[in-house]
Interface confidence: low
């Protein structure tokens, strides 16, 4: 067959769908690879062809669009399953072609089983809610396009295994779930089950997401440097190891890049000749406030090193701060024999 631009297997789009539920899968060509949409392609006389490779097989097969009740169908650039079966798992290819042009891409589709409490191998999106921030909502995701706007689905929300009814601060509002005041106790997996009728059949869409309650922007502050501080002096003799921790607290801020770095005499450690190592550790609170510790280490410090300026810097979306460590050379202990001898000899 003639050459075809093959985009390969697009593993970035590992699509997971639940067994026995409808699934609509758009051909990724138009979304990620080509600079034109399906309508343009169709009006230019290009045809979209679908085929697949079953799990653990190498043979490409055409998709059977003649199953009872049109279980699998194609509509424009969408492949429909009404509903999916477990053995629909495989790699699916959509190919756009005419006599002079051909482009194709494959993507993995995994049909996943869930238990009665909605547990499954499905990768769950995470939705962050601010703690004690007033009313916040999550929306049942990825249900657009499954039914026309005139069809009114019923939506049932669950937290874990339990239907959300008469919860103190969580109220189902159709496609939305409202949290009146989000608390740590609201952390968990939330599932919406959307039930809608179509051609005399009833279909269910199950969507689970993880809610994580995080620090509120109302409480957010610029970074706080706990160490170094004015109370601790790093007093070393030449030849000893110098260890200075920089410990910084960052309030949770959505999409903020938290940074910590050291400067030595105003330069980054990489830009100077001293043998310095920096080790970083990060810990999080329950509301995803972050504590970063960067330990600056000089194995064998020299008297020159002990005269340098060591400054810890921190930056977040809330601001930038810096704090110098108090480093000094330890005064040598008195050599008593010499001093005493001198003392007596002064008579």
């Amino acid at each position: 067959s003639e050459r075809c631009d093959d985009w390969g297997l697009d593993t970035m789009r590992q699509i997971q769908v639940f067994e026995d539920e409808p699934a609509r899968i758009k051909c990724p060509l138009f979304e990620h690879f080509l600079k034109f949409n399906y309508s343009t392609a169709h009006s230019a006389g290009l045809t979209l062809i679908w085929y697949w490779t079953r799990q653990d097989r190498d043979l490409e097969e055409p998709i059977n669009f003649r199953l009872p009740e049109n279980r699998i169908s194609k509509e424009k650039d969408v492949l429909w399953f009404r509903p999916t079966l477990l053995n629909d798992t495989g790699n699916y290819t959509c190919m756009l072609r005419n006599t002079t042009y051909c482009s194709k891409v494959a993507f993995p589709l995994e049909v996943v089983q869930k238990d009665s409490c909605f547990n499954s191998p499905m990768k769950l999106p995470v939705h962050k809610l601010y703690i004690e921030y007033g009313i916040q909502r999550i929306t049942c995701p990825n249900v657009d396009g499954y039914f026309p706007s005139s069809v009114k689905p019923t939506i049932t929300w669950y937290m874990g295994c339990y239907k959300i009814q008469n919860f103190n601060n969580v109220i189902p509002e159709g496609m939305n779930l409202s949290f009146l005041i989000a608390l740590i106790s609201n952390n968990g997996n939330y599932t919406c089950v959307v039930t809608y009728p179509e051609n005399g059949r009833t279909f269910h869409l199950t969507r689970t997401l993880t809610v994580k309650v995080v620090g509120s922007p109302k409480n957010a502050v610029p970074p706080v440097i706990h160490s170094p501080n004015d109370h601790v002096v790093y007093e070393k003799e030449p030849g000893e190891e110098l260890l200075i921790p920089c410990t910084v607290y960052f309030s949770f801020l959505m999409d903020s890049r938290n940074e910590v770095w050291w400067t030595i005499d105003g330069k980054k450690p990489d830009d100077i000749t001293i043998d310095v190592t920096i080790n970083e550790s990060i810990s999080h609170s329950r509301t995803e406030d972050e504590t970063r510790t960067q330990i600056l280490s000089i194995k064998k410090v020299t008297s020159e090193d002990l005269k340098r300026s060591y400054v810890c810097h921190a930056r977040s979306a809330k601001g930038e701060v810096a704090k110098a460590a108090k480093v000094k050379q330890k005064v040598p202990a008195p050599r008593y024999t010499v001093e005493l001898a001198c003392g007596f000899g002064a008579t």
């Epitope: 026309p148 706007s149 189902p172």
Partner: antibody
Framework: EVQLEESGGDLVQPGGSLRLSCAAS?????????MCWVRQAPGKGLEWVSC?????????YYASWAKGRFTISRDNSKNTLYLQMNSLRAEDTAVYFC???????????WGQGTLVTVSS | DIVMTQSPSSLSASVGDRVTITCQAS??????LAWFQQKPGQAPKLLIY???TLASGVPSRFSGSGSGTEFTLTISSLQPEDFATYYC????????????FGGGTKVVIK
């Protein structure tokens, strides 16, 4: 011609019951997503009562005040919509319209209405 | 329940005037809003659905806009046959489907 025609309106005593019908002609119920009832008290505005999905599941929706007293149903073979009204009150006095909804065109087809009077 | 607040409740206008009627939903209803015209003794007639789509056979002087909670019906140049009462209908497509009409706006001759 595509049309809806209500019937069954009458004078009824408070606490009584009544069943309204709405016959569709010129189209099949199954081509309509929803069949609904709307009422209008004399000299007042429109008030939604209930809707039923035309597919086999027959999902029903009610205004909160109508739940428990009013029941919507349909007979696809007769192309007819019903509204069973129980425990009627004076404030239920109104013209009752049936309306159909297709493809997101909310209430694109209406009947002429039937008058229900609740009075002793 | 969802509440649709329509304003004004009545307005007087002349032929050729531009008329604007607003409707506010107590909840986010996306674009699930329709506008109707009703004349005395008649059933309502659908003018606009999905907030801005003109129903079949409706003159182009009628237009709708808005989404979420704020919606507007505009008659660009009022004609004699447009004197009537106008209603908005909001559809709250959530766990239990709720339809609600606005209180109506009566357009009378000035």
């Amino acid at each position: 011609e595509v049309q809806l025609e209500e019937s069954g309106g009458d004078l009824v005593q408070p606490g009584g019951s009544l069943r309204l019908s709405c016959a569709a002609s010129g189209f099949s119920f199954s081509s309509s997503y929803y069949m609904c009832w709307v009422r209008q008290a004399p000299g007042k505005g429109l008030e939604w009562v209930s809707c039923i999905y035309a597919g086999s599941s027959g999902v029903t929706y009610y205004a909160s005040w109508a739940k428990g007293r009013f029941t919507i149903s349909r007979d696809n073979s007769k192309n007819t919509l019903y509204l069973q009204m129980n425990s009627l009150r004076a404030e239920d006095t109104a013209v009752y319209f049936c309306a159909s909804e297709t493809d997101g065109n909310y209430f694109n087809l209406w009947g002429q209405g039937t008058l229900v009077t609740v009075s002793s | 329940d969802i509440v649709m607040t329509q304003s004004p409740s009545s307005l007087s206008a002349s032929v050729g005037d531009r008329v604007t009627i607003t409707c506010q939903a107590s909840e986010d209803i996306y674009s699930n809003l329709a506008w109707f015209q009703q004349k005395p003794g008649q059933a309502p007639k659908l003018l606009i659905y999905r907030a801005s789509t003109l129903a079949s056979g409706v003159p182009s002087r009628f237009s709708g806009s808005g989404s979420g909670t704020e919606f507007t019906l505009t008659i660009s140049s009022l004609q004699p046959e447009d004197f009537a009462t106008y209603y908005c209908l909001g559809v709250y497509t959530y766990s239990t489907d709720i339809h609600a009409f606005g209180g109506g706006t009566k357009v009378v001759i000035k």
